[in-house]
């Protein structure tokens, strides 16, 4: 079969890095700069992805492989293949319509990317907030005031928790 | 074949004033949302200002009520009037055509000029 498909199809023998020539008489030509073919039997070579602005080389183009781009320091990739870069914020922050802001109080994001989430609500669980959230860290929940109570298996006291919005003295 | 060039960069003293132009050809520029961006020696890329179509604009924290991005679509033209200026605005500053129209982010098929040096100091 492979020979009957050369015989009706002289591109099929051109391989990768290469493209079939109608010009020049159905010849494998090499793909031109900044160009490339990742199978045999092309009739033309693809351009070239180019890295800029933002994004920045992290695989140079070949004749057999498009170029692959990340982000500068500052962005992460998003989409597929890093088809846009999203600047970071701080920990504590979001990126809304204005750039980086603060995570509201109540609310806290623990990365440099994404969303403030709102902090665990411990008393859904029946719990108590050992550790205060802040725009950084969510809450830490801790036994129920049940567990705490006279004769309840002894329980190391934690430290005290600061308040959000106090520094120490 | 898509061109952004900027001009307008030089030195000037803290407190003084520039005004960054961005040359635009090759695409339809009225209809598309365009950006200014920066990048301080030796940090990472910074997004400034962008403006929509529509001509509702967005800054960044630091340079809001100092800097004012505007567009003139007959002359395809972008702008950058930069007051007040700081050591700390010192940078290549970058004419991006912003495809995103998300403050912060941007795609791979956005158009960047070859950015133009504003060097803040006395």
């Known amino acids: 079969f492979e020979r009957t498909r050369s015989l009706q199809d002289p591109c099929s023998n051109c391989p990768a890095g290469t493209f079939c020539d109608n010009n020049r008489n159905q010849i494998c030509s090499p793909c031109p700069p900044n160009s490339f073919s990742s199978a045999g039997g092309q009739r033309t070579c693809d351009i070239c992805r180019q890295c800029k602005g933002v994004f920045r080389t992290r695989k140079e183009c070949s004749s057999t492989s498009n170029a692959e781009c990340d982000c500068t320091p500052g962005f992460h990739c998003l989409g597929a293949g890093c088809s846009m870069c999203e600047q970071d914020c701080k920990q504590g922050q979001e990126l809304t319509k204005k750039g980086c802001k603060d995570c509201c109080f109540g609310t806290f994001n623990d990365q440099k990317r994404g969303i403030c989430r709102p902090w665990t609500n411990c008393s859904l669980d029946g719990k108590s907030v050992l550790v205060n959230g802040t725009k950084e860290r969510d809450v830490v929940c801790g036994p129920s005031p049940a567990d705490l109570s006279p004769g309840a298996s002894s329980v190391t006291p934690p430290a005290p928790a600061r308040e959000p919005g106090h520094s120490p003295q | 074949e898509v061109q952004l060039v900027e001009s307008g960069g030089g030195l000037v003293q803290p407190g003084g004033s520039l005004r960054l132009s961005c040359a635009a050809s090759?695409?339809?520029?009225?209809?598309?949302?365009m950006s200014w961006a920066r990048q301080a020696p030796g940090k990472g890329f910074e997004w400034v200002a962008s403006i929509y179509s529509s001509g509702k604009t967005y800054y960044v924290e630091s340079v809001k009520g100092r800097f004012t991005i505007s567009r003139d679509n007959a002359k395809n033209s972008l702008y950058l009037q930069m007051n007040s200026l700081r050591a700390e605005d010192t940078a290549v500053y970058y004419c991006?055509?912003?495809?995103?129209?998300?403050?912060?982010?941007?795609?791979?098929?956005?158009?960047w000029g070859q950015g133009t040096l504003v060097t803040v100091s006395s």
């Open positions: 991006a055509r912003w495809k995103t129209l998300r403050v912060g982010v941007w795609d791979e098929s956005d158009y």
């Open positions: 090759g695409f339809t520029f009225s209809s598309s949302a």
